[in-house]
């Protein structure tokens, strides 16, 4: 014959445990129902009556099946350096995490207790190890041939731009400045050449500009990508 299904409360068989979502009440010495997440035990069970559950009040929660007499209080509101990534509901606590540009200096079980701003690497230094949710940025001096001209928690040291002729050599905090060359048209592969910003990175730089043997006028080239100069008639 099939075993009889026991309804809570019931006395467990000697040596056996209560079923899933039930708990053993020491006072009543019975297996009783747990309350579902978002509820708490308003009245504990007896030998003849099961647990009476009630919903959690505002700003309180229970996340698990439980038989607690009171719901847990949600954590305090997130501070200005944090963002609320999970709201306080009857079934879950509020979770605060650090906002962009900050990292968690002191964590708690869920979320962060104390946020701190990510370190910014000053010019001449670049990011060696980026910041994470729980670790600060690590900066390093830019190696010869590389530079960083920003104060930033994300910028790495970048190679100096390649120059045909170096006007101002780069250093750790400044890209090289190039002088454009102006050869005769027969030496160019195409019809017209415009002064053009150039860049990529040097491995090794001496602190002196180069002598330019280029005929005609020379232009200092701006750094970084941009379109050719308007109305220019060539190098």
């Amino acid at each position: 014959l099939p075993a009889q299904v026991a309804f809570t409360p019931y006395a467990p068989e000697p040596g056996s445990t209560c079923r899933l979502r039930e708990y053993y009440d020491q006072t009543a010495q019975m297996c009783c129902s747990k309350c579902s997440p978002g509820q708490h035990a308003k009245v504990f069970c007896t030998k003849t009556s099961d647990t009476v559950c009630d919903s959690c009040e505002d700003s309180t929660y229970t996340q698990l099946w439980n038989w607690v007499p009171e719901c847990l209080s949600c954590g305090s509101r997130c501070s200005s350096d944090q963002v609320e990534t999970q709201a306080c509901t009857r079934e879950q606590n509020r979770i605060c995490t650090c906002r962009p540009g900050w990292y968690c200096a002191l964590s708690k079980q869920e979320g962060c207790r104390l946020c701190a701003p990510l370190r910014k690497c000053r010019p001449g230094f670049g990011v060696a190890r980026p910041g994470t949710e729980t670790s600060d940025v690590v900066c390093k001096p830019c190696a010869p041939g590389t530079f960083s001209n920003t104060t930033s928690s994300t910028d790495i040291c970048r190679p100096h731009q390649i120059c045909n002729v170096v006007a101002i050599p780069g250093n750790a905090s400044m890209d090289a400045v190039c002088t454009s060359t102006s050869p005769t048209r027969s030496m160019a592969p195409g019809a017209v050449h415009l002064p053009q910003p150039v860049s990529t990175r040097s491995q090794h730089t001496q602190p002196t500009p180069e002598p330019s043997t280029a005929p005609s006028t020379s232009f200092l080239l701006p750094m970084g990508p941009s379109p050719p100069a308007e109305g220019s008639t060539g190098d």
Epitope: G145, I156, R158, P159, H160, I162, C163, N164, V165, V166, P169, G170, A176, S180, T181, P183, M187, A188, P189, H193, L194, P195, Q196, V198, S199, T200, R201, S202, Q203, H204, T205, Q206, T208, P209, E210, P211, S212, T213, A214, P215, L221, G224, P225, S226, P228, D235
Partner: antibody, heavy 120, light 111 residues
Framework: EVQLLESGGGLVQPGGSLRLSCAAS????????MHWVRQAPGKGLEWVSA????????YYADSVKGRFTISRDNSKNTLYLQMNSLRAEDTAVYYC?????????????WGQGTLVTVSS | QSVLTQPPSASGTPGQRVTISCTGS?????????VHWYQQLPGTAPKLLIY???QRPSGVPDRFSGSKSGTSASLAISGLRSEDEADYYC???????????FGGGTKLTVL
């Protein structure tokens, strides 16, 4: 007419050294960055190294940094690549190339190439 | 693995128009840097085909044209001829690397 002529390639054992040369003519050599670009057998192009026109600044790919040295002699219109601690993966045709006018990130003229074979 | 991505092969019949793509990222093409194209005929050294996205060196037929948009560029060859059978490489400057970066190359076959 712009001409670039490489020489110095050959067979070398792993760990050995080789010096490549590139003789340039037909343009104002000292006004242009010069580059070395290589091509392993059956593979694509890989930029290796560059040097500014006045030879004050040199540039290297990470794969050769510390092993290769680029230099130039503007009085002789010649570009060099000293290759030390050679590895099997350095086997390639090595081309010298002239930086473009106003923008050294393109190569408007190339040499015919010289083959470097690193093998025991 | 090349920094710039090209299809390994392309083909077309004589007279057709073919396009070869070159896809980069925000540190190279997408950073505003120019794209250059090289043609390498079998057994020869590479030759500059297109520079600064769409400029043709003297001597390059106007059948070859280049364009750039966002993080990618393309080379178009119209009126395909048998002598166009070659490897084509794109190249650009990259913010984080010391020199120009190349695509892996596209082998163009004229059927």
């Amino acid at each position: 007419e712009v001409q670039l002529l490489e020489s110095g390639g050959g067979l070398v054992q792993p760990g050995g050294s080789l010096r490549l040369s590139c003789a340039a003519s037909g343009f104002t050599f000292s006004s242009y960055a010069m580059h070395w670009v290589r091509q392993a057998p059956g593979k694509g192009l890989e930029w290796v190294s560059a040097i500014s026109g006045g030879a004050t600044t040199t540039y290297y790919a990470d794969s050769v940094k510390g092993r290769f040295t680029i230099s130039r002699d503007n009085s002789k219109n010649t570009l060099y690549l000293q290759m030390n601690s050679l590895r099997a993966e350095d086997t390639a045709v090595y081309y010298c190339a002239k930086g473009g006018t106003g923008d050294p990130y393109y190569f408007d003229y190339w040499g015919q190439g010289t083959l470097v074979t690193v093998s025991s | 693995q090349s920094v710039l991505t090209q299809p390994p092969s392309a083909s077309g019949t004589p007279g057709q128009r073919v396009t070869i793509s070159c896809t980069g990222s925000s540190s190279n093409i997408g950073a505003g840097y120019d794209v250059h194209w090289y043609q390498q005929l079998p057994g020869t050294a590479p030759k500059l085909l297109i520079y600064r996205n769409n400029q043709r060196p003297s001597g390059v037929p106007d059948r070859f044209s280049g364009s750039k948009s966002g993080t990618s560029a393309s080379l178009a060859i119209s009126g395909l001829r048998s002598e166009d059978e070659a490897d084509y490489y794109c190249a650009a400057r990259d913010d984080g690397l010391s020199g120009p970066v190349f695509g892996g190359g596209t082998k163009l076959t004229v059927l």
